[in-house]
């Protein structure tokens, strides 16, 4: 008789990240008997939904069901049928939907209603769709990376899990960049958090954490670009915008109505004598950087120190994991290596932005032109945000680690969100903790 393997005693969870530019579905798996151990939950699948973010479906809500089908069917295949009914599904929408809600709460509700109706049709345990706050987005991102890096585990290890690690239990700060917002979250060093809105208190695995977090709405890379264009077109003498953030020879026509569609450009809105304008790239990093800095109001600070726009920011402390678009953009530009100094990154960006558009298109033939055209802006924006926005220096740049995955799981808010909603992060330390091998990509 053949030996039959005992069924794996595992559990699954699904989180959909409904971002401003796209939606991704993540499937997580963990041993059922080790739910409260740190580092045992891992990602087994990521499915990127084809199409834009859910906020773009506001005039075509009837298409949302089809939009979600492929990835939900993929989840049906990956998760054993016997476990479908007990697998929780959560959808969290971020800044794209926060912006839509600011424009029209009714339209945002309608989108979420249709999303909920669609997701309720699957055999999983659907737990609802909601717009998460910027504070949650920052906090869950911080929990995710520290959980995956084993920072919450009290077990001392005989080996070092990451090459740059100094103090095993020092948590990493989290830097998250999306299309519509950006989050900064970390534990300040013996510093009071002067604004209550930015303070979070956690007790995780028997230890207390006083965490600083802020989410800058409209300062994700896509909305920052819209802001910059709206600001710059104000002073353009005609319908040609010579833009240093695009490669020389690049041309693109922009509708003024599209420019003013987002609440993020309201402060720059004016009546223009034209309905369209043409961006003409001139590819100059320094000028691009200067233009971006004008989006950060640093003239006003009601606290001992600020990031920008009057938002409190304590002195930076410890190492930081920079993920989501921070990672994707820097990875494309080949600037994620630990060995690359801030000066070197700036040098590379200068060269990259100055490259003619025709040359860039040839070198990166496989990349969609819409994305390809924006890497000069995005890379420059990342440098401006980290250096002038968050006050990293040439020295502290070395503390930023551009992270895509840790132990095979994507860095981002979704894992932390699921861990919280499934009560898998105990306040107190469990009796035994497993050794967890952490690596990052």
């Amino acid at each position: 008789t053949q030996n039959k393997a005992l069924p794996e005693n595992v559990k699954y969870g699904i989180v959909l990240d409904a971002g401003s530019s796209h939606t991704s579905l993540y499937i997580y798996k963990w041993p059922a008997e080790k739910e409260n151990d740190t580092g045992v939950v891992h990602q087994v699948e990521e499915c990127r939904v084809k199409g834009p973010g859910i906020s773009k479906f506001v005039q075509k809500v009837n298409e949302i069901g089809i939009y979600l089908t492929d990835c939900m069917e993929r989840a049906r295949e990956v998760i054993p049928r016997s476990q479908h009914q007990e697998t929780p599904v959560y959808l969290g929408a971020t800044a794209g939907m926060r912006l839509l809600r600011m424009e029209s709460e009714e339209l945002a509700d309608r989108v979420l209603d249709v999303v909920e109706r669609s997701l309720s049709n699957y055999p999983f345990d659907f737990q609802g769709a909601r717009i998460i706050t910027g504070q949650e987005e920052g906090a869950y991102g911080w929990i995710t990376i520290n959980y995956l890096l084993g920072k919450f585990s009290q077990k001392t290890r005989w080996f070092s899990i990451v090459p740059y690690e100094t103090n095993n239990q020092e948590t990493f700060g989290a830097l998250d960049l999306g299309g519509a917002s950006t989050q900064v979250t970390f534990v300040p060093q013996n510093q009071t958090i002067e604004s209550p809105d930015n303070a979070l208190q956690f007790r995780l695995y028997g230890k207390d954490y006083n965490v600083y977090t802020h989410s800058f709405l409209c300062y994700g890379k896509d909305q920052a670009l819209w802001q910059k264009l709206a600001k710059d077109i104000q002073v353009a003498s005609n319908e040609i915008l010579r833009d240093p953030c695009f490669h020389p020879g690049y041309k693109k026509v922009v509708n003024v109505s599209d420019l003013y569609k987002t609440p993020c450009t309201k402060r720059f809105e004016m009546t223009l004598p034209f309905q369209q304008f043409e961006i003409q790239g001139i590819g100059n990093y320094q000028q691009c950087h200067q233009s971006i800095l004008e989006l950060f109001n640093t003239s006003y600070c009601p606290y001992s120190q600020c990031a920008f726009n009057g938002i409190f920011l304590p002195p930076l402390a410890g190492s930081f994991g920079a993920f989501s678009a921070f990672y994707f953009v820097m990875k494309f530009l080949n600037l994620t290596s630990e060995k690359v100094s801030q000066e070197k990154v700036t040098e590379m960006m200068k060269k990259f932005c100055a490259q003619p558009w025709e040359e860039i298109k040839t070198s990166y033939a496989g990349v969609k032109e819409k994305y390809l055209s924006e890497y000069c802006f995005s890379g420059t924006y990342i440098l401006s945000l980290l250096l002038q926005g968050y006050h990293f220096t040439a020295d502290s740049w070395a503390q930023i680690h551009f992270i895509g995955k840790i132990q095979g799981s994507d860095a981002g808010w979704t894992l932390g969100y699921m861990l919280n909603l499934t009560n898998m992060i105990p306040a107190e330390q469990p009796l035994s903790t497993p050794l967890s091998h952490s690596t990052y990509v």
């Epitope: 809600r101 509700d109 209603d113 909920e116 309720s120 706050t133």
Partner: antibody, heavy 121, light 107 residues
Framework: QVQLVQSGAEVKKPGASVKVSCKAS????????MHWVRQAPGQGLEWMGR????????WYAQKFQGRVTMTRDTSTSTVYMELSSLRSEDTAVYYC??????????????WGQGTLVTVSS | EIVLTQSPGTLSLSPGERATLSCRAS???????LAWYQQKPGQAPRLLIY???NRHTGIPDRFSGSGSGTDFTLTISRLEPEDFAVYYC????????FGGGTKVEIK
């Protein structure tokens, strides 16, 4: 489509309690708060409180604290409003009304048909 | 708590006329927290305007809301026979309160 169906009219004696139900359909029950508003004959609208069906948390108007209890049953998508120590001035039509999603603003988008509660000896 | 005072108590107008209803708050109300409802006899109230000036789905464009701070207005540009009803304003600041209502009746 969204529907809120309330239980039928009640006649109660002073000092008694009444429990009115409101069954929701056509949307994800846990996603929207539910409010209770009453209207005495020929009078205006008076807000009593709200419940978050997702977690069961409640917020009551000061006037009704200690006398009103709002609960929910997620398995049947139903919310309940119980008012105790009834007096004649509690004679009114009681409405449930669907409120906001989390993070939204407090306006009452959809109303039940109303339940008349008469308090009389 | 914030008290909302509606005026006039009754408005007697003919179909086709313009109706202007006022709602005054005892202290400043954020515009996003002011709404208007219509109630006909024997029916539940119906949301008309939210966020002081946004029309709820399906509400005709003859209904418009305006105002900020402590003074808000509901305007019905041309009264239709079905518009004769009681109108309530509502605010939210920790707790919900309603105004006493304005009855729009046929002259």
């Amino acid at each position: 489509q969204v529907q809120l169906v309330q239980s039928g009219a009640e006649v109660k004696k002073p000092g008694a309690s009444v429990k009115v139900s409101c069954k929701a359909s056509g949307y994800t029950f846990k996603s929207y708060e539910m409010h209770w508003v009453r209207q005495a004959p020929g009078q205006g609208l008076e807000w009593m409180g709200r419940i978050n069906p997702s977690v069961g948390s409640t917020w009551y108007a000061q006037k009704f604290q200690g006398r009103v209890t709002m609960t929910r049953d997620t398995s049947t998508s139903t919310v309940y409003m119980e008012l105790s120590s009834l007096r004649s001035e509690d004679t009114a039509v009681y409405y449930c009304a669907r409120g906001k999603r989390e993070g939204g603003t407090e306006y009452l988008r959809k109303w039940g048909q109303g339940t008349l509660v008469t308090v009389s000896s | 708590e914030i008290v909302l005072t509606q005026s006039p108590g009754t408005l007697s107008l003919s179909p086709g006329e313009r109706a202007t209803l006022s709602c005054r708050a005892s202290q400043s109300v954020a515009s996003s927290y002011l709404a208007w409802y219509q109630q006909k006899p024997g029916q539940a109230p119906r949301l008309l305007i939210y966020g002081a000036s946004n029309r709820h789905t399906g509400i005709p464009d003859r209904f418009s809301g305006s105002g900020s701070g402590t003074d808000f207005t509901l305007t019905i540009s041309r009264l239709e026979p079905e518009d004769f009803a009681v109108y309530y304003c509502q605010q939210y600041h920790n707790a919900i309160t309603f105004g006493g209502g304005t009855k729009v009746e046929i002259k």
